[in-house]
């Protein structure tokens, strides 16, 4: 249905990392434009990205209002230059997105090792608490603020001279691990939300090694 020169959007896909959330779709428009609407299951539709020739729409501002809600979006197709035109049923063509629950589905961004400090045979490794676009009281919340103890970090650490990766876990942003005196170690961290069934892990942080700038060594 619809006018002869418009086609419905398809392959509607949510792309979301640390709550930065974009809806993408196909096809690239030929003589047509798109408008996106988003709603919670029980809420009203809100229009975004009016009459755009893009095939993506940033919906971050809407989903961060309540990241635990489930959202649905739809993409309307209109003839270019004649956006009042409707399909044969009296409505413009549109396609629904899959449902999306940011808290459960947003990908965890690549973490960063902020610092590490060696004191004797102990090393303290600190993970940067990344800021998200989720706001409370006009303040941007960190990943830890949003997820609390649902978020853990896995630390992989290994002797520079070895390949086997030992692991440690924390539900804060700090690790305190035992190391062998006189050995240099390398570190990488991964964010994990164990309670999830999908998108449980982030990609690994860049590897940081002792003897490089980030760390500090103190002999006791």
């Amino acid at each position: 249905s619809g006018t002869t020169n418009t086609v419905a959007a398809y392959n509607l896909t949510w792309k979301s990392t640390n709550f930065k959330t974009i809806l993408e779709w196909e096809p690239k428009p030929v003589n047509q434009v798109y408008t996106v609407q988003i709603s919670t299951k029980s809420g009203d539709w809100k229009s975004k990205c009016f009459y755009t020739t893009d095939t993506e729409c940033d919906l971050t501002d809407e989903i961060v209002k309540d990241v635990k809600q489930t959202y649905l979006a739809r993409v309307f197709s209109y003839p270019a230059g004649n956006v009042e035109s409707t399909g044969s049923a009296g409505e413009p063509l549109y396609e629904n997105s899959p449902e999306f629950t940011p808290y459960l589905e947003t990908n965890l961004g690549q973490p960063t090792i902020q610092s590490f400090e060696q004191v004797g045979t102990k090393v303290n490794v600190t993970v940067e608490d990344e800021r998200t676009l989720v706001r409370r009281n006009n303040t941007f919340l960190s990943l830890r603020d949003v997820f609390g103890k649902d978020l853990i970090y896995t630390l992989y650490y290994w002797k520079s001279s070895s390949s086997g990766k030992k692991t440690a876990k924390t539900n804060t942003n700090e690790f305190l691990i035992d190391v062998d005196k006189g050995e240099n170690y390398c570190f990488s961290v991964q964010a994990v939300i164990p309670s999830r069934t999908v998108n449980r892990k982030s990609t690994d942080s860049p590897v940081e090694c002792m003897g490089q700038e980030k760390g500090e060594f103190r002999e006791i």
Epitope: K165, T167, Q190, V198
Partner: antibody, heavy 120, light 107 residues
Framework: EVQLVESGGGLVQPGGSLRLSCAAS????????IHWVRQAPGKGLEWVGY????????YYADSVKGRFTISADTSKNTAYLQMNSLRAEDTAVYYC?????????????WGQGTLVTVSS | DIQMTQSPSSLSASVGDRVTITCRAS??????VAWYQQKPGKAPKLLIY???FLYSGVPSRFSGSRSGTDFTLTISSLQPEDFATYYC?????????FGQGTKVEIK
């Protein structure tokens, strides 16, 4: 339903090689960690090693280091244990197991095991 | 590596008995201890995680506790299906290590 199914066990001569497979269903292995644990006849459980299939990181028990290699094929949702230079003391039932990955829960699901016998 | 010393290695008990199995870690492992049950020819099954939390579907007669580096598995009233071997395991550091096992037999 979460399931782990090991295969590839059998009789092998000392010094020989064998590759065990662990086919997972009901979950995506790259979202978890996979361990191999073995049990010699009439003995207790011995941890062999782990892999994080999302990045290929591994760690091995000293008793198998340099002889055993764990790998994973995420497209097949399967983990492997390549065993080289096998010894009589490697005779055991080999289990693959899923690591839930939280601070609290460690291994929550196990396969049924596959028997490896090293004998001449 | 951390050693987990489990005792006793075996015990005989009757249905309805209270059974206690202990595991001692060679160093601090916080609460990162699990208990598994294994029956002959079968894979182990998770009973207790994080020292004292009952895993989903496990009967409430099983319980776990911690005192420093000592960990205890208790079966409050032994049932016929509980005759099996029990293992503790620490996962505080790599490599994770198991206790030697405790075989619970019928008296």
């Amino acid at each position: 339903e979460v399931q782990l199914v090991e295969s590839g066990g059998g009789l092998v001569q000392p010094g020989g090689s064998l590759r065990l497979s662990c086919a997972a269903s009901g979950f995506t292995i790259s979202d978890y960690w996979i361990h191999w644990v073995r049990q010699a006849p009439g003995k207790g459980l011995e941890w062999v090693g782990y892999i994080d299939p999302s990045n290929g990181y591994t760690y091995y028990a000293d008793s198998v280091k340099g002889r055993f290699t764990i790998s994973a094929d995420t497209s097949k949702n399967t983990a492997y244990l390549q065993m080289n230079s096998l010894r009589a003391e490697d005779t055991a039932v080999y289990y693959c197991a899923r690591d839930y990955g939280s601070l609290q829960v460690f291994i929550d699901y196990w396969g049924q095991g596959t028997l490896v016998t090293v004998s001449s | 590596d951390i050693q987990m010393t489990q005792s006793p290695s075996s015990l005989s008990a009757s249905v309805g008995d209270r059974v206690t199995i202990t595991c001692r870690a060679s160093q601090d492992v916080n609460t990162a201890v699990a208990w598994y049950q294994q029956k002959p020819g079968k894979a182990p099954k998770l009973l207790i995680y994080s020292a004292s939390f009952l895993y989903s579907g496990v009967p409430s007669r099983f319980s776990g506790s911690r005192s420093g580096t000592d960990f205890t598995l208790t079966i409050s009233s032994l049932q016929p299906e509980d005759f099996a071997t029990y293992y503790c395991q620490q996962h505080y550091t790599t490599p994770p290590t198991f206790g030697q096992g405790t075989k619970v037999e019928i008296k």
